[in-house]
Amino acid sequence: IPTEIPTSALVKETLALLSTHRTLLIANETLRIPVPVHKNHQLCTEEIFQGIGTLESQTVQGGTVERLFKNLSLIKKYIDGQKKKCGEERRRVNQFLDYLQEFLGVMNTEWIIES
Amino acid sequence: IPTEIPTSALVKETLALLSTHRTLLIANETLRIPVPVHKNHQLCTEEIFQGIGTLESQTVQGGTVERLFKNLSLIKKYIDGQKKKCGEERRRVNQFLDYLQEFLGVMNTEWIIES
């Protein structure tokens, strides 16, 4: 898979492959995988990809199911890259406060908050 | 501050306090704090709260600015709790795939993806 494929296209294709291979993936009825209990997905990327790893090790490889796991591995690579960018730029306090304000604003309006 | 205050109310109050104390917080003109370079805030919570720690250590405490940092510490506590909930429940593959599909769907529609 060329890593040059835009990440947005990669995600779309992965969603389609996930749908296609669902029957094969759920064949193991005794397997249990940790599932986050809330919808703030970005907080749980580590656990999600650990789960994908567990699933991959239990799935017969070959054909396009292999492509599914390759895609998921590229998505992980993208997210790891984004995480690296969390601390790259050192800026003045004012700019940090603008980012913090935006973060809290998004938390206020978009997060699913259970008290 | 009672920890029983709903997190959503806590975030709103913190936004107001941030605005109130901005002048005091930016007084240190030479301080530099890492600022994430993308809008996927949830991926960067660790770095954001490290930055808050740096800022707190450089800010003269007292009055309601103390309340601001207490609030931010409670928000961190809430987020840490959410992170713990990422791997608490072990579920069948089918349920994991539903979560994965939702995660990729949200990534597809809501994340700010730069190729």
């Epitope: 790259e88 730029e89 050192r90 800026r91 003045r92 004012n94 700019q95 603008d98 980012y99 304000q101 935006e102 604003g105 | 901005r22 002048t23 930016i26 007084a27 003109e29 030479t30 530099r32 600022v35 994430p36 370079v37 993308h38 809008k39 700010i112 730069e114």
Partner: antibody, heavy 117, light 109 residues
């Protein structure tokens, strides 16, 4: 490498509104590490900071121009814009857009705007 | 608001050292940035955070800052250094950018 390009009319009539757009390429305007700024330079004079904006919409303006200036951002187009109202001949200048981290990192090439009837 | 004062012009012979000053109240407590601007071109950063050089800027360019004066020093001046030089600081309350009036460096000869 981030590149910035100013666009807009080179001639504006007195009392009208000057409107310029800056298109950012080679980087995202949603980059949390940057503000997006406008600076101008009157003929033969020094640089004058007009204002800047964060991707979230937070704006900061030069107090001497604040009453006439509006800076906005369009993250979907990777652009930010300047509007300066009630212009006079004193607003004739080269207008630059620039990315602003701890300093002005990247600049547009500048566009001359003349205010004349 | 905060004011930065620069001499309008400085002249120097090739090979000599040019010093361009930037005055401001207690400027030593701020970070100072210096830009070089040649005719018809956009400014280019030559010194940031008082004395640090961006990559690609010759070692001949250096800066210092203390008390009420920041100084840009260009040693072994070359004809190609002829340009306008502007200092810049942040005025933190509220977060505004301030430029000096600019200094025209003329290389004699």
């Amino acid at each position: 490498q981030v590149q910035l390009q100013e666009s807009g009319p080179g001639l504006v009539k007195p009392s009208q509104t000057l409107s310029l757009t800056c298109t950012v390429s080679g980087g995202s305007i949603s980059n949390g590490g940057y503000y997006w700024s406008w600076i101008r330079q009157h003929p033969g004079k020094g640089l004058e900071w007009i204002g800047y904006i964060y991707y979230s919409g937070s704006t900061y303006y030069n107090p001497s121009l604040k009453s006439r200036v509006t800076i906005s951002v369009d993250t979907s187009k990777n652009q930010f814009s300047l509007k300066l109202s009630s212009v006079t001949a004193a607003d004739t200048a080269v207008y630059y857009c620039a990315s602003l981290g701890n300093w002005f990192d990247y600049w547009g090439q500048g566009t001359l705007v003349t205010v004349s009837s | 608001s905060y004011v930065l004062t620069q001499p309008p012009s400085v002249s120097v012979a090739p090979g000599q050292t040019a010093r361009i000053t930037c005055g401001g109240n207690n400027i030593g407590s701020k970070n100072v940035y210096w830009y070089q601007q040649k005719p018809g071109q956009a400014p280019v950063l030559v010194v940031h955070d008082d004395s640090d050089r961006p990559s690609g800027i010759p070692e001949r360019f250096s800066g210092s800052n203390s008390g009420n004066t920041a100084t840009l020093t260009i040693s072994r001046v070359e004809v190609g250094d002829e340009a306008d030089y502007s200092c810049q600081v942040w005025d933190s309350s509220p977060d505004h950018v301030v430029f000096g009036g600019g200094t025209k460096l003329t290389v004699l000869g």
